[in-house]
Interface confidence: low
């Protein structure tokens, strides 16, 4: 083995270096000292650190550590912040043009239905918003809700529009026999289907990138143990001690040392691995009625379609609802 | 069904969107993204790694510390000496992963069983019998689009519909990310943001 | 480079006919829905008529309903405008320009135009 | 018929800020904004009321209220001055323009 240059004389290299690390030089011997105090740093011989340096020393290899591991992850939090934020907003997009494209359609096609039927969208739209960003909303509810309000609009507007207003207090009626007479045939139920397939992938898809957001912040921000930060200062910095200013770690040291401090950080790794394949496999998927970009912009196109069918029945209902509801006061249906 | 223009309207037309192979949509989008996640299926595993990396580690020098002193890069002693009445090492490891990162690990076992309770085989489709209860209704077409929709009178066939997130202020290409200045291609078992 | 170049403009006579044409480049044409908008001298911009990326939907102005006929036709990247019956008032630069819709088929103007021609002239007067 | 409303001409010093209203937008659709620039053809600035075509300086922000929107200008320099048009839909989805604004810089 060849033997070590000899270490500095004066310890002036060493408080030089020292003095970036920790301003005021009254740390750092003048020449080098027995060092029988020092914990980390054991000295073979005589020493230019002192056990304050030592201390300074640790805290500053931890604190490297903490910033390795924040540029290690850098570019992967970056990936899913970024995502996370970008799948949010066309989530958002998405619920908004599919109203705006149901509203449209009201418009365009029954005109008469407005502004009462925007009102009932709007509502119907804004929970499903709700339900992707996490709320306790029963999606059957929402389509439930939404097709309860429209029918008795879709009554008096479209099927009945003689009705005199003193009729109108038959809403609750309607909004029964709406279920029980099945008005729309099984849209709601395909609406249903539909909605709650493509809003429960989606939800969870986001859920899925926040966590991966949590999980990257978790090890982002870990604090190392003393022990470590002991092996880091040994690694890292005990060469200067010996005046050995400009030697690096051996590669394969370093290797040891670091899966020692990072043993509980690479536990995750068999879970991370699991995610991200899980989430592959959600995202693939992710189509037809599990994709809520092509359910919810399909969607006017289906209410459309669901009143057309209520029109194509009108007689029948119109006769059967005559009857039902004829005595509202009596006989609510709810 | 619901097209806007009135004389299309009452022609009942069946509209095809044109499918769009090259446009960016809300799917490619969430694909390009598991690729990209893909290349860092191995970042824990390879954290250790990068960090030495990432650190000042003798590399073309023919001496390096061990902990203790200098010794020749590739002698034994390059990896074992600096341990020695050091601390014990196989102790460290055997501590386990702290609280906060078992808390995560829980999260993380959920999710994933979330994720493939989620996932649905491939092939389902949407049951088309809408003819079952009520009066009367259309049927779709088993073809290879999603019929959304159900009237049989000129039902709208829906395909890849969004060339999406034209709208949205974000540049997700990783080029732009910070720190993301040359990047090497990554290998299989590398973490692929890493760069020396 | 996506592109638009309009051609066809000129003088003409109350009551007569022209036909512009724009030519498109740089971009996949026929997925696209596409406008012409028209500004007289020394007024603002006025939307004329639109057609859908496959051509089958149509769309007009009050102004010219009846009056003028859109189409395309995606296998020459290329978007008309027949204009008869004219009048003095559709003296105006016309631009064809492409709109920013998304792709969505069954839903146009929604987004913007997002690329104009030069614009071509049309004169109306005896 | 659906009109949009914007101010026939509004002015500034370079470097200010100013501001193009652009009322009656009442079919629930995103405003776009367009500027011409003296014998040129109009161009897309911001689209879906607040977004920018790459290419477009960050000076150029819009936002939207209600039935209102406006376009915002920080910064103002001298070949900003040009006309400035919104557009939107009316309730049959066809396009409909503003009347436009004429920018005079100072």
């Known amino acids: 083995q060849p033997p070590p240059p000899p270490p500095d004389a004066t310890c002036h290299q060493v408080r030089s270096f020292f003095q970036r690390l920790q301003p005021g030089l009254k740390w750092v011997p003048e020449t080098p000292v027995p060092g029988s105090d020092l914990q980390v740093c054991l000295p073979k011989g005589p020493t230019c650190c002192s056990r304050k340096m030592e201390e300074k020393y640790q805290l500053t290899a931890r604190l490297n550590m903490e910033q390795l591991l924040q540029s290690a992850s850098m570019e992967l939090k970056f990936l899913i912040i970024q995502n996370a934020a970008v799948f949010q907003e066309a989530f958002e997009i998405v619920v908004r043009h599919a109203k705006n494209y149901t509203n449209a359609m009201f418009k365009n096609n029954y005109p008469s239905l407005t502004p009462q039927a925007f009102e009932f969208v709007g509502e119907f739209f804004t929970d499903v918003s709700l339900y992707i960003l996490g709320s306790d909303i029963n999606v059957d509810d929402m389509v439930n809700e939404l097709f309860d309000s429209l029918f008795p609009v879709i009554y008096t507007q479209l099927m009945n529009p003689g009705l005199p207003d003193s009729a109108l207090d038959i809403n609750e009626c309607l909004r029964g026999a709406r279920r029980d007479l099945k008005v729309f045939g099984n849209f709601p139920k395909l609406i249903m289907t539909q909605v709650s397939k493509s809003l429960q992938v989606t939800r969870i898809f986001l859920q899925a990138l926040n966590l991966g957001i949590e999980v990257i912040n978790t090890t982002d921000h870990l604090k190392f143990s003393k022990d470590c930060g002991r092996m880091l200062t040994r690694m890292w910095y005990c060469s200067y001690c010996q005046g050995l200013m400009m030697v690096k770690p051996c590669g394969g040291y370093c290797n040891v040392v670091m899966q020692g401090c990072m043993a509980g950080v690479v536990e995750i790794d068999k879970y991370w691995r699991e995610y991200i394949l899980s989430l592959e496999e959600l995202v693939n998927g992710m189509y037809r009625i599990y994709d809520m970009e092509n359910v919810l912009l399909g969607l006017f196109s289906t209410i459309h379609d669901s009143i057309q069918y209520v029109q194509k029945n009108a007689g029948k209902l119109t006769t059967t609802i005559g009857k039902l509801c004829a005595h509202s006061q009596q006989r609510q249906y709810r | 069904s619901a097209y806007y223009p009135e004389d299309l309207f009452i022609d009942k037309k069946v509209l095809k969107v044109a499918h769009v192979e090259h446009e960016e949509t809300l799917s490619s989008r969430r694909r390009e993204l598991i690729q990209k996640l893909k290349s860092f299926i191995s970042f824990y595993s390879a954290l250790p790694g990068y960090i030495c990396s990432h650190s000042p580690v003798a590399e073309n020098d023919t001496l390096c510390w061990n902990g203790q002193e200098l010794v020749e890069r590739y002698s034994q002693k390059a990896a074992r000496n600096g341990m020695k009445n050091q601390f014990n090492l196989h102790e460290l490891k055997m501590k386990g992963p702290e609280p906060v990162v078992s808390q995560i690990i829980d999260k993380l076992k959920h999710i994933n069983q979330l994720l493939r309770t989620m996932s649905m085989p491939k092939g389902r489709v949407l049951d088309k019998n809408l003819d079952e209860e009520g009066f009367e209704s259309g049927d779709c077409g088993d073809d290879e689009d999603e019929c959304i929709g159900g009237s049989g009178d000129g039902m709208i066939k829906v395909k890849n519909q969004l060339r999406f997130l034209a709208e949205l202020a974000y540049d997700l290409d990783v080029d732009d990310a910070p720190g993301n200045s040359q990047q090497a291609t990554p290998k299989d078992n590398e973490i692929s943001t890493f760069h020396n | 480079e996506v592109q638009l170049v309009e051609s066809g403009g000129g003088l003409v006579q109350p009551g007569g006919s022209l036909r512009l044409s724009c030519a498109a480049s740089?971009?996949?044409?026929?997925?696209?829905?596409m406008s012409w908008v028209r500004q007289a001298p020394g007024k603002g911009l006025e939307w004329v008529s639109g057609v859908s990326g496959s051509g089958d939907g149509t769309y007009y102005a009050d102004s010219v309903k009846g009056r003028f006929t859109i189409s395309r036709d995606n296998s020459k990247n290329t978007l008309y405008l027949q204009m008869n019956s004219l009048r003095a008032e559709d003296t105006a630069v016309y631009y064809c320009a492409k709109e920013y819709d998304f792709g969505l088929g069954w839903m146009h103007y929604y987004y913007g135009m997002d690329v104009w021609g030069q614009g071509t002239t049309v004169t109306v007067s005896s | 018929q659906s009109v949009l409303t914007q101010p026939p001409s509004v002015s500034g010093a370079p470097g200010q800020r100013v501001t193009i209203s652009c009322t009656g937008s009442?079919?629930?659709?995103?405003v776009h904004w367009y500027q011409q620039l003296p014998g040129r053809a109009p161009k897309l600035l911001i689209y879906g009321s607040n977004n920018r075509p790459s290419g477009v300086p960050d000076r150029f922000s819009g936002s939207n209220s209600g039935t209102s929107a406006s376009l915002a200008i920080t910064g103002l320099q001298a070949e900003d001055e040009a006309d400035y048009y919104c557009q939107s839909y009316d309730s049959s989805l066809n396009a409909i323009f503003g009347g436009g604004t004429k920018l005079t810089v100072l």
């Open positions: 009442s079919s629930g659709y995103d």
């Open positions: 740089g971009f996949t044409f026929g997925n696209y829905a």
